[in-house]
Amino acid sequence: MGKGDPKKPRGKMSSYAFFVQTCREEHKKKHPDASVNFSEFSKKCSERWKTMSAKEKGKFEDMAKADKARYEREMKTYIPPKGETKKKFKDPNAPKRPPSAFFLFCSEYRPKIKGEHPGLSIGDVAKKLGEMWNNTAADDKQPYEKKAAKLKEKYEKDIAAYRAKGKPDAAKKGVVKAEKSKKKKEEEEDEEDEEDEEEEEDEEDEDEEEDDDDE
């Protein structure tokens, strides 16, 4: 979704992101040849940020404000490429693909990870959650797996009922060609559902990031 468009304005940076960038530059000046241990570096940055006074944080907040204004200004004149609208018609009434056990687990522990490491990117938050999940005892994973199985069962019933009813015409036209085999059709729908889940996770993270900016 515009990820590959070189003309798209660079995303706005938070005050903390500017702070981390400054830390990185300072570190490079002091140790030009040293390689950076990312987790240690981000931990140190996070600790420093927590102990900084409002006055010290002020200059980074000003930088963030200026960058936000720049982003908003650039976005006003930005025209996305033609093909950037949704590829496929998605029926809003279609049952949502159920979350996996890991996804449910992430919903529980994401706030803690993000709160303890405010500067982590979405990818690094996901990485940490993955590590946590891998360190979780089988018995502790069970409640999430049970709930995910229940939701999957419900989804399968709902999707069967939804398919039996028949999709809206627009959906039929936009998504599936009549001659496709049933198996191919289902595979496509599964892929679509997976995209839904990924998009939801992205949206959730973006929402949370906006909340972080507000704080």
Partner: antibody, heavy 119, light 108 residues
């Protein structure tokens, strides 16, 4: 200061009910999995029940399953243990504890509240 | 259920001395989910070691944990007067997250 403070213990007859509370302070309560652990007089520690950060997932020791219910109110920073159909063997000091991330190693404990089940 | 057996039941030591506490699991367990606690009379337990060998912040380095499989050890070096207490091991890798019966470290 990170603190957990239990309340609600007391003397109750067999078959009776009691509700324990645990007030948390000094940390972001809604981030943590929370647990109840008990210790019968002069005995060892026994895990009772745990609840996930949002309260959506719970687990219980077999000895209390169907009788005890763990819950939490993140807006009040409080953990609860509703104990029904109490038995003499439930007599113990009940501790609430904070889980060290997802793992059941408990890094912060309350001072405990005594529950005595006796006729 | 996995049983945790601690030995000895009581360990008599003098301040400044070192001691070793043992905990044996009834079957091989993951060291990632193994902890040690200290409890003084009338107080709540305190986490000393998690993941078999990691110390939480604030725990002095005279407490160290090791072990894998079925045998785990807590080593107390240079005992301080405040170290005389009961020590519990715990396996938290599978429900019911069992604790050992405890080892009492008393002053000789």
């Amino acid at each position: 200061e990170v603190q957990l403070l239990e309340s609600g213990g007391g003397l109750v007859q067999p078959g009776g009910s009691l509700r324990l509370s645990c007030a948390a302070s000094g940390f972001t309560f809604s981030w943590y999995k929370m647990t109840w652990v008990r210790q019968a007089p002069g005995k060892g520690l026994e895990w009772v029940s745990s609840i996930s950060p949002s309260g959506g997932f719970t687990s219980y020791a077999d000895s209390v399953k169907g009788r005890f219910t763990i819950s939490r109110d993140n807006s009040k920073n409080t953990l609860y243990l509703q104990m029904n159909s109490l038995r003499a063997e439930d007599t113990a000091v009940y501790y609430c504890a904070r889980d060290l991330d997802i793992r059941h190693a408990f890094d912060i404990w309350g001072q405990g509240t005594m529950v005595t089940v006796s006729s | 259920d996995i049983q945790m057996t601690q030995s000895p039941g009581t360990l008599s030591l003098s301040p400044g001395e070192s001691g070793t506490l043992s905990c044996r699991a009834s079957e091989s367990v993951s060291s990632r989910h193994f902890a040690w606690y200290q409890q003084k009379p009338g107080q709540a337990p305190r986490l000393l070691i998690y993941g078999a060998s990691s110390r939480p912040t604030g725990i002095p380095d005279r407490f160290s944990g090791s072990g894998s499989g079925t045998d785990f050890t807590l080593t107390l070096s240079r005992l301080e007067p405040e170290d005389f207490a009961v020590y519990f091991c715990q396996y938290y890798g599978s429900s019911p997250y069992t604790f050992g019966g405890g080892t009492k470290v008393e002053m000789k």
